[in-house]
């Protein structure tokens, strides 16, 4: 993708406050790294409707992060 550079966050802007649960295919959490200094919550939408960034400060994002961390650790 020509405009995509290393050292960039994946989300442009703060993100949406919420996504309908029924529309969520999967949720990915990107933790702060050399590429991006903030946590990012990326939602893949069902029916090939692309991806959306969820505002990591939102209630829904905090719930997702908690759920994923519980699952992983």
């Amino acid at each position: 993708f020509p405009m995509f550079k290393r050292g960039r966050c994946l989300c442009i802007g703060p993100g949406v406050k919420a996504v309908k649960v029924a529309d969520i295919e999967k949720a990915s959490i990107m933790y702060p790294s050399n590429n991006c200094d903030k946590i990012e919550v990326i939602i893949t939408l069902k029916e090939n409707k692309g991806q959306r960034c969820l505002n990591p400060k939102s209630k829904q994002a905090r719930l997702i992060i908690k759920k994923v961390e519980r699952k992983n650790f």
Epitope: F4, L10, G13, V16, G50, Q51
Partner: nanobody
Framework: EVQLVESGGGLVQAGGSLRLSCAAS????????IGWFRQAPGKEREGVSC????????YYADSVKGRFTISSDNAKNTVYLQMNSLKPEDTAVYYC???????????????????WGQGTQVTVSS
């Protein structure tokens, strides 16, 4: 009511400059990514540039890199596209659009945007 209004288009000679404005109302640009797109007659709409006003991140299509500069004024709720060294192939209708929750890989995908302006015509003569 949400509205995006573009202005600043016009007729300019090759090598000249124009500054487009995109004035937003009904929402705060700080909460959104604002993108500029263009559509030339008989061609597909293409993404030109994108900005996150919340952190100042800017993105450009290869075709305009080094010639166009995107910026924002949060107090005026307006995004600008400064276009220098214009070429005849830059002739198009230029649109601004707003997206929330935009992912970098989809920044120039039209369906990712929630709101669109009506466009402003830019004509570059040789």
């Amino acid at each position: 009511e949400v509205q995006l209004v573009e202005s600043g288009g016009g007729l300019v000679q090759a090598g000249g400059s124009l500054r487009l404005s995109c004035a937003a109302s009904g929402f705060t640009i700080d909460d959104y990514a604002i993108g500029w797109f263009r559509q030339a007659p008989g061609k597909e709409r293409e993404g030109v540039s994108c900005i996150s006003s919340s952190d100042g991140s800017t993105y450009y299509a290869d075709s305009v890199k080094g010639r166009f500069t995107i910026s924002s004024d949060n107090a005026k709720n307006t995004v600008y596209l400064q276009m220098n060294s214009l070429k005849p192939e830059d002739t198009a209708v230029y649109y601004c659009a707003a997206a929330q929750g935009l992912v970098v890989t989809e920044m120039f995908v039209g369906r990712s945007y929630d709101y669109w302006g009506q466009g402003t015509q830019v004509t570059v003569s040789s």
